[in-house]
């Protein structure tokens, strides 16, 4: 992202690059289902995707007031193996329920320091943050 | 996110809230597999999660120079139904391969305007952007 303007003075860009939060309200990013109760190792025939999956999962909240997004959700698998498509409850040892990970871009609020080293408000620091998105039914790896 | 400081002057916060891009280099956020070739409706016994899944998918790039993150990846299912755990190739009509969607927080670059309406560099506008994360093998909905 080196060609994105910084809000610090830099060559070739306006001297004051203010990156302002839009005042447009953004609804919270909640997964379709946050019903952490009555979750078990079974594939439902209705409800949201994470409960109908044969590799069902639940979501756990990760809240950090100094981060954007403040709320992230981590998937947690409810079964070690995949659930049978036929019954929706018995596990099939031929399939593993594995977490799918993603390195998400997040921004942490950090104190900014002016030219003289004094505190000049807050800056954003971009980081990668690993989140688990879902559980996926996969064929186990065959070691060569 | 109303309690996050704005970089515009506001009560209770320092008058100049500069949100600066960190100079820490961030590696590109590429999924483990971007091999768009030799993708087919089968579950492999090796390779990345998206090719071993019984609801396999490929990734498609979404690049926008005016957005952070600039590169996002959308999952695209390779099969309408789930692949049999036994064979890894034949489809099982008892299971559907469905896309899992997520509204991701992204930031668009917009011209900032100073007090007199003149262009004062760039601001960030926070938006929700729908991305498909993965394909999940689910039991079809049973209509009540």
């Amino acid at each position: 992202y080196s060609h994105w303007p910084s809000c610090c003075p830099s060559k070739g860009y306006p001297s004051e690059e203010l990156l302002r939060w839009s005042t447009v309200p953004v609804p919270p990013l909640k997964p379709a289902s946050l019903d952490f109760h009555s979750v078990s190792c079974r594939a439902s025939e209705d409800g949201p995707l994470n409960s109908r999956a044969i590799s069902p999962w639940r979501y756990e909240l990760d809240r950090d007031l100094n981060r954007l997004p403040q709320d992230l959700y981590h998937a947690r698998c409810l079964c070690p193996h995949c659930v049978s498509l036929q019954t929706g409850s018995h596990m099939d040892p031929r399939g593993n329920s594995e977490l799918l990970y993603h390195n998400q871009t997040v921004f942490y609020r950090r104190p900014c320091h002016g030219k003289k080293g004094n505190h000049k408000g807050y800056c954003l620091e971009r980081r990668l943050y690993r989140v688990s998105l879902a559980c996926v039914c996969v064929r186990p790896r065959v070691m060569g | 996110y109303s309690h996050w400081p704005s970089c515009c002057p506001s009560k209770g916060y320092p008058s100049e809230e500069l949100l600066r891009w960190s100079t820490v280099p961030v590696p590109p956020l590429k999924p483990a597999s971007l091999d768009f070739h030799s993708v087919s409706c089968r579950a492999s016994e090796d390779g990345p999660l998206n090719s071993r899944a019984i609801s396999p998918w490929r990734y498609e790039l979404d690049r926008d120079l005016n957005r952070l993150p600039q590169d996002l990846y959308h999952a695209r299912c390779l099969c309408p139904h789930c692949v049999s755990l036994q064979t890894g190739s034949h489809m099982d009509p008892r299971g559907n391969s469905e896309l899992l969607y997520h509204n991701q927080t992204v930031f668009y670059r917009r011209p900032c305007h100073g007090k007199k309406g003149n262009h004062k560099g760039y601001c960030l506008e926070r938006r929700l952007y729908r991305v498909s994360l993965a394909c999940v093998c689910v039991r079809p909905r049973v209509m009540g």
């Epitope: 992202y1 080196s2 060609h3 | 790039l61 979404d62 120079l65 005016n66 600039q70 668009y108 670059r109």
Partner: antibody, heavy 120, light 108 residues
């Protein structure tokens, strides 16, 4: 100073493959955010985007023409290539290469254009 | 696929007159770009990211708009502004750059 210049066969027969070269200077296609695209314009008509290639070798194509197009680059010699398979009279046009990026998705620099004619 | 419709197709203006042309998108777009093309020449970028003036473009040109409605304005028409103007947008996914059909501006 940024310059781009297109070159091609000028004339070719129906069903042949059109090969175009864009030679550029004043920027590097290894710079993050940089891209080079191809746009064509039939005589007296509007502009149509064909394809572009990014600094990291990501290629993107117009879906309507994707099956016939191949874009590639040689960063060291500052060239981008476009091949169009199975040409016919609908492909008669002036072909432009243009730079994209690194900051936005406009085309800030264009080549002078190369006229391509298809005739049996 | 987003379609850009420019209006009017042809227009004319006196020197010194204010000129405004429109570009309507079939669905909402984030940014609009404007190019100027004179006969026998390559297109030239005038406006990027809806309202920013490209390098070397006279300040009499300006762009505005949002959503599906965008416009290019020339505050005072000059003889050298006689040309065809194209609006352009891009969609990041699936990737697609589209141009409007053009507005031909003539000098009276």
């Amino acid at each position: 100073q940024v310059t781009l210049k297109e070159s091609g066969p000028g004339i070719l027969q129906p069903s042949q493959t059109l090969s175009l070269t864009c030679s550029f200077s004043g920027f590097s296609l290894s710079t993050s955010g940089m891209g080079v695209g191809w746009i064509r314009q039939p005589s007296g008509k509007g502009l149509e985007w064909l394809a572009h290639i990014w600094w990291d070798d990501v290629k993107q194509y117009n879906p309507a023409l994707q099956s016939r197009l191949t874009i590639s680059k040689d960063t060291s010699s500052s060239q981008v290539f476009l091949k169009i398979a199975s040409v016919d009279i609908a492909d008669i046009a002036t072909y432009y290469c243009a730079r994209i990026g690194p900051v936005h998705h406009g085309f800030p620099y264009w080549g002078q254009g190369a006229l391509v004619t298809v005739s049996s | 696929q987003i379609v850009l419709t420019q209006s009017p197709a042809i227009m004319s203006a006196f020197p010194g007159e204010k000129v405004t042309m429109s570009c309507s998108a079939s669905s909402s777009v984030n940014y609009m770009y404007w190019h100027q093309q004179k006969p026998g020449s390559s297109p030239r970028l005038l406006i990027y990211d809806t309202s920013n003036l490209a390098s070397g473009v006279p300040v009499r040109f300006s762009g505005s708009g949002s959503g599906t409605s965008y416009s290019l304005t020339i505050s005072r028409m000059e003889a050298e502004d006689a040309a065809t103007y194209y609006c352009q947008q891009w969609t990041s996914y699936p990737p697609m750059y589209t141009f409007g059909g053009g507005t031909k501006l003539e000098i009276k």
